[in-house]
């Protein structure tokens, strides 16, 4: 029989880690190894059709890619469909799809509301989603001792997929679920450079664990202006949440790494400034499969899609892909050897989720939700070199964290900052002897009023449901 | 609650090796780093070397480097520390001892001691 | 490696004095130093770690200072349960060295 994949990815844009470009050399060769192994779909052929889910400007859509999923539906009838990754573009097309009953199978929609399996039936993420990402953040507050307060600091993009709105919004929810902790938000427009210095007062009184989503330069810019603010390593500590590692890429992210240098004359202030930062990343699988499946990822791009792929985390998502469908094929496999159909999207995915399975990505954990548990790694910088190394990985399944090659974590006065003041945020420990503090710190403390309306919070509701905010 | 539990008391001929083991409990073992520490009779603390569990990195004091080698098994949660060509001056109390590398409090929990006699 | 050099070797104090126990880096070690108590037969105790954190269940009366190259440790009541061997510890990097150790003896 014939087995049909609808695939709803960007086609001509190459920059989205789902891009067609990238993922489809790694379900060729998935659906290679498919053909190759006569345990797997014995006597059916998958074919792939293709549909975008950009506008005709290039970007994710969430108008074309549910007309684009329409028309594959009624075209081809697939068996499933592969994407979208975009979160705009995947939440339409996961309502549909929940309503065809047809499996909808991606390694990118990551934000917290695809986990909804009510509105979102049969959708299956193979690749990492930002609630997991709650997950090792809420682990290491709990190992570090940071069971009060948190901040979290965001930055708005005009025009794109708001990928730092989802990030914050998976970690916030996740964390205050798992840990009785006040995690406050705060969004900013990148560029706006006054904005930051706002943002930084705002910063002094709420908070001394900070994550961070922004640009590699953004990042850097808030850290210069933290320094010049005062605000350092021995109090504050900031977690710049580049899950791709683009900070950790490029030309000062060759080895060693120093994300904070740029020689553009500030590099003596920005590694003085990044003994106070540290940045988690997706963690880069180290299985010898997954070097082998990137070098014929490579040449296959190269020779059949005419694009070259770049070294980086950006290549766990095409792997991801890769890994999701041959769970898939062996969820249909198993269906159909227990008499049922290929149509059947409910039995068939109920088979992929909360199971093990072995991958170029190594040792891959669906949930029993049909998300995957995901790995993260925490680099640091050593305060000798100023070269920013993984010191832990977080495993998704164990929920462990692990230390590694005899790295510790570089605190300025020894020991991690509390993430409370000894006497509060406006100092209002009575415990605290107020003369100790001088009228200069005072009036670095802005009210809330001051900011006015360039405060935005994330509202419960905007985190629950997809819209442009 | 944390321990660490060491083998027994050992003597040993001068030229034999000796493996002391340390066994790690009431923690997630992947998660700290175990540091080994000799004490040579009425004599001071010296720091033998450090493993990380997770992934087996070493790292030893130059004294012993080339006669020490550390361990571990996560399947059972213990760290070995193998040391060959004993002479009398081996003759010392071994402590296995664990570090956490995120918080940075070094040596934080101990195990009891293993004594090595080193004796023709 | 980096060389700790603890002071004085041995001291003989009373109960309820005030005693100070040095320790110096032979190069620079942030915060980065522990101060440990032994007792014969005992394996080391931690009191202090990054310099002037007090390890918890380790009585108030210990309390650490310095940072850089020059560290103290400090009982400011010596009780009959104190009389030691005391041992600075480097943790800044790969090898960890000790102090040689101070014997606090009851005078």
């Known amino acids: 029989g014939n087995l049909t994949v609808a695939v709803v990815l960007p086609l001509a844009n190459t920059s989205y880690p789902w891009s067609w470009a990238r993922v489809g050399p790694a379900v060729e060769l998935a659906l290679a190894k498919v053909k190759a192994r006569p345990d797997l779909l014995p006597g059916w052929t998958v074919r792939t059709v293709l549909g975008s889910s950009e506008s005709a400007l290039g970007v994710c859509s969430d108008t074309a890619a549910p007309l684009t999923a329409v028309d594959l539906k009624w075209e081809h009838n697939p068996a499933v469909f592969l994407g979208p990754g975009c979160v705009y573009a995947a939440a339409p097309v996961g309502r549909f799809t929940a309503h065809w009953r047809v499996p909808l199978l991606t390694a990118g929609a990551p934000a917290l509301g695809f986990g909804a399996k009510d509105e979102y039936a049969l959708t299956t993420r193979a690749g990492p989603s930002h609630a997991k990402l709650g997950d090792f953040v809420a682990a290491l507050h709990r190992r570090l001792g940071w069971e009060r307060q948190a901040l979290v600091l965001y930055a708005y993009q005009p025009g794109d997929d708001q990928p730092c709105f989802f990030v914050v919004g998976g970690l916030y929810m996740r964390v205050r679920d798992r840990l009785n902790i006040t995690v406050d938000h705060l969004e900013f427009a990148e560029g706006d450079r006054d904005h930051y210095t706002l943002l930084l007062r705002t910063v002094r009184r709420k908070g001394r664990v900070i994550y961070i989503c922004s640009s590699p330069d953004t990042f850097r810019t808030l850290m210069l202006l933290a320094l010049e603010a005062g605000l350092s390593g021995e109090d504050y500590v900031f977690f710049h949440l580049d899950l791709f590692g683009h900070s950790l890429q490029g030309a000062h992210g060759l080895v060693p790494r120093r994300p904070w240098e740029r020689e553009d004359g500030q590099d003596v202030s920005a590694h003085q400034a990044f003994q106070a930062a540290k940045i988690i990343t997706y963690k880069e699988p180290d299985n010898p499969e997954y070097l082998e499946f990137l070098r014929k990822l490579k040449h296959l791009a190269r020779e059949q899609f005419n694009f070259t792929m770049e070294d980086g985390l950006v290549n766990t998502i095409p792997a991801a892909f890769h890994d999701g469908l041959l769970l898939y094929a062996q969820a249909v496999t198993e269906t159909l050897a227990h008499g049922g159909t290929v149509t059947d999207g409910e039995s068939i995915t109920q088979r992929m989720w909360n199971r093990s399975f072995q991958g170029v990505t190594g040792y891959l954990k669906m949930d029993s939700n049909g998300d995957r548990e995901t790995d993260f790694s925490l680099w640091d910088m050593d305060p000798e070199t100023g070269a920013f190394r993984v010191v832990l990985n977080f495993n998704g399944t164990s929920q462990e964290l692990v230390t590694v090659s005899g790295h510790t974590l570089n605190w300025p006065l020894g020991h991690p900052p509390p993430d409370v003041p000894r006497c509060g945020f406006d100092n209002e420990d009575p415990a605290c002897n107020q003369d100790h503090f001088s009228t200069l710190e005072e009036q670095k403390l802005i009210s809330e009023e001051d900011l006015g309306g360039e405060q935005k919070l994330i509202s419960e509701e905007d985190l629950h449901h997809h819209h442009h905010h | 609650q944390v321990q660490l539990v060491q083998s027994g008391a050992e003597v040993k001929k001068p030229g034999a090796s000796v493996k002391v083991s340390c066994k790690a409990s009431?923690?997630?073992?992947?998660?700290?780093?175990i540091h080994w520490v000799r004490q040579a009779p009425g004599q001071g603390l010296e720091w033998m070397g450090i493993?990380?569990?997770?992934?087996?990195?070493?790292s030893y004091a130059q004294n012993f480097q080339g006669r020490v080698t550390m361990t571990r098994d996560t399947s059972t949660n213990t760290v070995y520390m193998d040391l060959s060509s004993l002479r009398s001056e081996d003759t010392a109390m071994f402590y296995c001892?664990?570090?956490?590398?995120?918080?940075?409090?070094?040596?934080?929990?101990w195990g009891q001691g293993t004594l090595v006699t080193v004796s023709s | 490696a980096i060389q700790m050099t603890q002071s004085p070797s041995s001291l003989s104090a009373s109960v309820g004095d005030r005693v100070t126990i040095t320790c110096r880096a032979s190069?620079?070690?942030?915060?980065?130093l522990g101060w440990f108590q032994q007792k014969p037969g005992k394996a080391p105790k931690l009191l202090i770690h990054?310099?002037?954190s007090l390890q918890s269940g380790v009585p108030s009366r210990f309390s650490g200072s310095g940072s850089g190259t020059d560290f103290t440790l400090t009982i400011s009541s010596l009780q009959p349960e104190d009389f030691a061997t005391y041992y600075c510890l480097q943790d800044y990097n790969y090898p960890f060295t000790f102090g040689q150790g101070t014997k606090l003896e009851i005078k």
């Open positions: 190069q620079g070690i942030r915060y980065d």
């Open positions: 990054a310099a002037s």
């Open positions: 009431g923690y997630t073992f992947t998660s700290y780093y």
């Open positions: 493993i990380s569990p997770s992934d087996g990195y070493t």
């Open positions: 001892a664990r570090n956490d590398p995120l918080t940075t409090v070094a040596l934080d929990y």
